[in-house]
Interface confidence: low
Amino acid sequence: SLLPVPYTEAASLSTGSTVTIKGRPLACFLNEPYLQVDFHTEMKEESDIVFHFQVCFGRRVVMNSREYGAWKQQVESKNMPFQDGQEFELSISVLPDKYQVMVNGQSSYTFDHRIKPEAVKMVQVWRDISLTKFNVSYLKR
Amino acid sequence: SLLPVPYTEAASLSTGSTVTIKGRPLACFLNEPYLQVDFHTEMKEESDIVFHFQVCFGRRVVMNSREYGAWKQQVESKNMPFQDGQEFELSISVLPDKYQVMVNGQSSYTFDHRIKPEAVKMVQVWRDISLTKFNVSYLKR
């Protein structure tokens, strides 16, 4: 069944954690729907963002962090593994030095840690998607 | 009660018609939620757009048209009558020469007709809002 969007969940992340998201764009790529995933430092939407991942479907992906309320240096990618009208599975894995983003099983983006992933307290998934799965898995010690 | 978003309704417009929308942004302005209203020439989302109205809450409004699949000259406004976290009432009136956009009863934007409003067959309201009212009123002959 569909999860509500925006979807917000408390989360604790560290090396070995993976956030898995399954969904579908709500509009054709011509109309430029967005997907956004934000890793927040607090259970408040206005809190800082350790990792900001925004897809403009069919066009580009931007990644960034928001520190002390200010956006930092944006990283942009034109890589577009998402398919128009198709369901996607997105997984964000916490590696020792970076986040690795897989789309439909294919390594598609990376983002170097600017703030330690242990600072994350909440994950929000939102914008122009329907959402069918959200899961945070933790590496077994 | 809440209307589904994206919200799509068949509509016929002409001078004197008014489209009224009531809703609320789904995120704080710091996170830059969007509102988009598109007047389409067909009941298909990939059809041309006679009037495209997109609000990036707290930042700017852009207006445009999409003709033969291509976006034309964008009109941008920094006027921002929307209030962070507050419900808004948006009305788009069809005047003989332009669209007039009112926000909470205040004339806020205009957009000159590029394609005759009679070409409109469908209105779509979408992006990061909850929607409580959508209405198309027609001028009594």
Epitope: L3, P6, Y7, T8, E9, E45, Q124 | P25
Partner: nanobody, 121 residues
Framework: ELQVVESGGGLVQAGGSLRLSCAAS????????MAWFRQAPGKEREFVAA???????TYADSVKGRFTISRDNAKNTVTLQMNSLKPEDTAAYHC???????????????WGQGTQVTVSS
Amino acid sequence: ELQVVESGGGLVQAGGSLRLSCAASGRTFSTYSMAWFRQAPGKEREFVAAITRSGGNTYADSVKGRFTISRDNAKNTVTLQMNSLKPEDTAAYHCAAGGTYSFVPRSYNYWGQGTQVTVSS
């Protein structure tokens, strides 16, 4: 339109328990996420707990392990079981319904008037 009404508040000693209930009218109850917020005099409204349409839940750090949120879609109710109550839990508790699952009050469209919980030391 969804109407929500809270009940179950009252005066309780520190360490005691209370069970708040939220009754919703409307056939669309099961399509909404539900949440409890609280507001103490002179303070901002504070998130307490939320539950998705399918029963997934989350809690504010301050109540985790002490409060439990649950819902019964057949009866159109949401309950908040509050154990090991502390004086700082004193507040008006509001039930809210919305199309999103969030910690943010503005994400919720329908609100109850609230029920007062007072915890004495």
